[in-house]
Every structure is written in C-alpha cells, then in structure tokens.
Amino acid sequence: EEELQVIQPEKSVSVAAGDSATLNCTVSSLIPVGPIQWFRGAGPGRELIYNLKEGHFPRVTPVSDPTKRNNMDFSIRISNITPADAGTYYCVKFRKGSPDVELKSGAGTELSVRAKPSAPVVSGPAVRATAEHTVSFTCESHGFSPRDITLKWFKNGNELSDVQTNVDPAGKSVSYSIRSTARVVLTRRDVHSQVICEVAHVTLQGDPLRGTANLSEAIRVPPFLEVTQQSMRADNQVNVTCQVTKFYPQRLQLTWLENGNVSRTEMASALPENKDGTYNWTSWLLVNVSAHRDDVKLTCQVEHDGQPAVNKSFSVKVSAHPKEQGSNTAAENTGTNERNIY
C-alpha cells in the first residue's frame, strides 16, 4: 500500500487585499484515519488556521464538503484577506490518537497579499520661502505589498531629479511604507506651479496614484514698490501713489507715514489676480502742501506676509511749488529711499 501523501500543488498564491484566498490540499489516501489541520508557519510557534475537528474559524471555510466519507480534498478558503494574513500555510495530516499524532505535512503554500498603497500625501515646507531658495516636499504612502514600488516627482509635468526615497521596512514584512523627499528651487513664476508625487504599484493596474501640492502654499513673492506723485492740483494738494506689484500671497498691510507719523493703514483684500498668480495694489495719499510750512517726508511702508516692512520715502518741498506739476515723478525702487519733489 502506497504511503499517504499530502499534496499542496501551489508553491505560492498571490491575492489582493479584501479578496478570498484558496489554499489547495489533497491527500492520496483516506488511510490512516485522522484529521487535517492547517497552520501558518512551521515549528513550535506555528499558528493554527483551521481544524475541522474543533474550534471556531469564522473566516475559513472548507472548499469541499468535509463531512463526505470519501473526501480527500482539504482545500480551504480564507475570506477578506489582509496583509497580516501573508505567510506560508501548511496542510498537515494527523493520525488518530489521544492526542492525534502528526503524520505528514504538505510542502507549504506561500500566501502573498497584494495590498494597494494608500493615497500619497504630499506635505510642503512649514514656512514659505522666496524665489531662488530650495524647499523640500515630502510624499508618504503606506500599507502596500509587495515591496516593489515606483515613486516619481513632477513639477509642472517635468520630472524632478533631486529626490531621496526610502521604502520601509528593509526586511520582510506584511506591508510596507514609502517616504520620499523632493527638493525644489523656487522661481517668482511658481505661484501657479504644482508638484505631483506619483506612485506606481502592481496592485494599481497601471493607473498610478497621485498626490499633489501647490507651490502657492510654499512660496512668497515679495512686492516691488514704486511711489509716484501725480500732478499738483489747483487746491495745492499733491496726489502721491504707492504701487505695490507682483506679490504673493495677498496678505499685505500698507501704511502711509507723514514725517514719521502714521497717516493711514490699509489691508489688501479681494485683489484681482495677475496671470502669474501674483497681485498688484495701488494706494493713494492726498497731501495738502499748503498746510505744511516745512518739507513733508512721505513714507509708503509695506508689511508683506509677516515679513519685515519695506519702505519707500520721499520729500515734498513746500517752499517752491508751482501751481501745475508736469510729468509724474517716481521714487527709486530701493528698500528705503528719499526723493525731493519739486
């Protein structure tokens, strides 16, 4: 009589998380009598997965009717597979006894679980940076299996090369995580730019997952300041304009000072957006020249996005004011500048 064989035909089975896994096992003989048990792992620490004789295994069902007297198929189906179910499963035949005695084990079937990576989450720098500076973006995705995964970074459709990526853990695990950092050099034109983290994995059937971050969250474009005087009006009032241009974000406070004293403070709001995503703002100040005996020092002070204030100053000469002023006069575009207006 031929010796009983325990046959596990598949060396490995790969299943998507959430699906059911079928682990096949047949025996070559009904003799000797005794139960079949399924274990995950081998040796003394093995985990009992299914035992028809006793116990409650809600996720495991026999493929064939185990009560049939001539049943030699002890395949099982495990439902709702998770990455934690990965491992090598052994179909083990026992000989009846008190207790039952292990007679023969199948060769084992390795169950690998294909788990989709979570949606990539991209996080940018905690504080904004200005053009020409380098900022770092981080992309994280978790819970995938197998370990092989591809992650790419793009800025406005162009792949980034200054990238560092790690997949953890390095050794064998039920599931893995990926973390990648991309370094991006900002330009003034990046308000509308976007970085994309693209994750490709066998479970995604060629349709990669993407996480995005807008550079508008990371960039600060400081304003240009230009102060000009409009024509002298008949009533001896001078209209001075402070043009604040090409700034981002919109959070901006403008203060007019006359001879160092605050004249007016304004907050930018509901500004129209430029094509490049930046904003412009113009503020006017009417100065009554006749009310002053001495020259008037005017300062346009701009505080942008919590940064130190930028000033443009100039002086209006009270002594010699013609009734009509010709062309507009602008203050130079430097941090702090005084300009005499005649």
């Epitope: 009904l30 003799i31 000797p32 009598v33 049939k68 007297r69």
Partner: antibody, heavy 124, light 106 residues
Framework: QVQLQQWGAGLLKPSETLSLTCAVY????????WNWIRQPPGKGLEWIGE???????NYNPSLKSRVIISVDTSKNQFSLKLSSVTAADTAVYYC??????????????????WGQGTTVTVSA | SYELTQSPSVSVSPGQTASITCSGD?????YAWWYQQKPGQSPVLVI????KRPSGIPERFSGSNSGNTATLTISGTQAMDEADYYC?????????FGGGTKLTVL
Amino acid sequence: QVQLQQWGAGLLKPSETLSLTCAVYGGSFSTYYWNWIRQPPGKGLEWIGEINHSGSTNYNPSLKSRVIISVDTSKNQFSLKLSSVTAADTAVYYCASSHYGSGSFPDSYGMDVWGQGTTVTVSA
Amino acid sequence: SYELTQSPSVSVSPGQTASITCSGDKLGDRYAWWYQQKPGQSPVLVIYQDDKRPSGIPERFSGSNSGNTATLTISGTQAMDEADYYCQAWDSSTAVFGGGTKLTVL
C-alpha cells in the same frame, strides 16, 4: 437525541421492489448521515448504504446496482428502494443515524442510533 | 474488498473480563466501532472511534485499536452483557461489519 421510526411492506414477491421509509424525530437533520443496514435471519449485519441531507450517497458495492436511497428534508424522512428482490434479500432492515456534527472528519462517525427494524420476507 | 474477522464465540464467567477481537489489514489506521445486539433487538452502539463510550454505556465497556486488531473489553462481565457483538470500520466510504461474536456468560 435522535429517534428513528421505520415502516414499509413486509412481504414481497421475487423481482418486486422493496420500499422502506424512516422518519427522524429530534436532532438536526443536516448534521447526520442516514444509513440502511440489513440482517438476514441468523446472520450478521450488512451495510446497504447512506445519504446525507443534501442527497450525497454512498452504497455497498455489492448492492449498488439495485439500491436507491433518497431523502425528503421537508418531512425529515429518508427512504430505501431495493429492486429485483430475491429470497436472498429476506432480512430485518434497520435504519440508523450517523451523527457527524461540526467537529468530525471523514470516517470519524458510525451508527449511533438505530430504528426498531422491519422484517422483510421475499417469497413466491 | 476490506474484511473484518471476528471469532464466532467467546465465553466468560460472571465477574470476569471478556475480550472480543476484530482483525483487519492495518485496522489500527482506521476507526473501529462496536455494536451490541441482544436477541430480537436492534443493535446498540457501545464503543465508537476505537475507545470512546457513548453516554449511557457502562464503564465496564472499553475499547482499543492498534496494528491489525481492535479489541472490545468487558470487565466484570454481567449476565445482561450476553449478546452478539459486531465490530465495524469504514473502507472507501463503505461500512464493513465483522461477522459478529456471540458472548456467552456462563
């Protein structure tokens, strides 16, 4: 505990078909195999065959060509038909249950409860 | 086909131990059942799965099974134990009975 009550024709002529029924009282009908066994006068027991609630059958190879065992789960009954009887089929016929429950495996259950027996005589 | 062999008869004095044997090829690799049948009655299961006793069966009934032989042992045999005893096993989904042993209590 299951109880079995059986009935059927006791006197048959050769070539007729023996027909017996066994009613099941108590227990879960779906956790048993239902058996027929016979015992010729002064002789030993001979297993005829079995059926479970879903209609799965096993028969004694020596009788297989003449035997049909069926089940009526709505009535909790199972039946035996043995065709083309001869005098050699004269015997006491028993129905019996084999409880396998949820903790059994193949060949781990035998005949734990028996019916009262029906004497069947085949005579010309 | 598989065969189970029993000695036709065994005699025992009351209070003594009766051993009834059943032999078959590698019977120890299978489960053995034992049934008691008294005259004019249906068989009653006295031992199942080699050595297990159904509820209601006296403790004096015990069983063993190894190698090629299964044994039903009745210790402290009583007159009421006089009956025919049948062993049974399964072979390829077929129940096989031994020829039976008549136990006589002298």
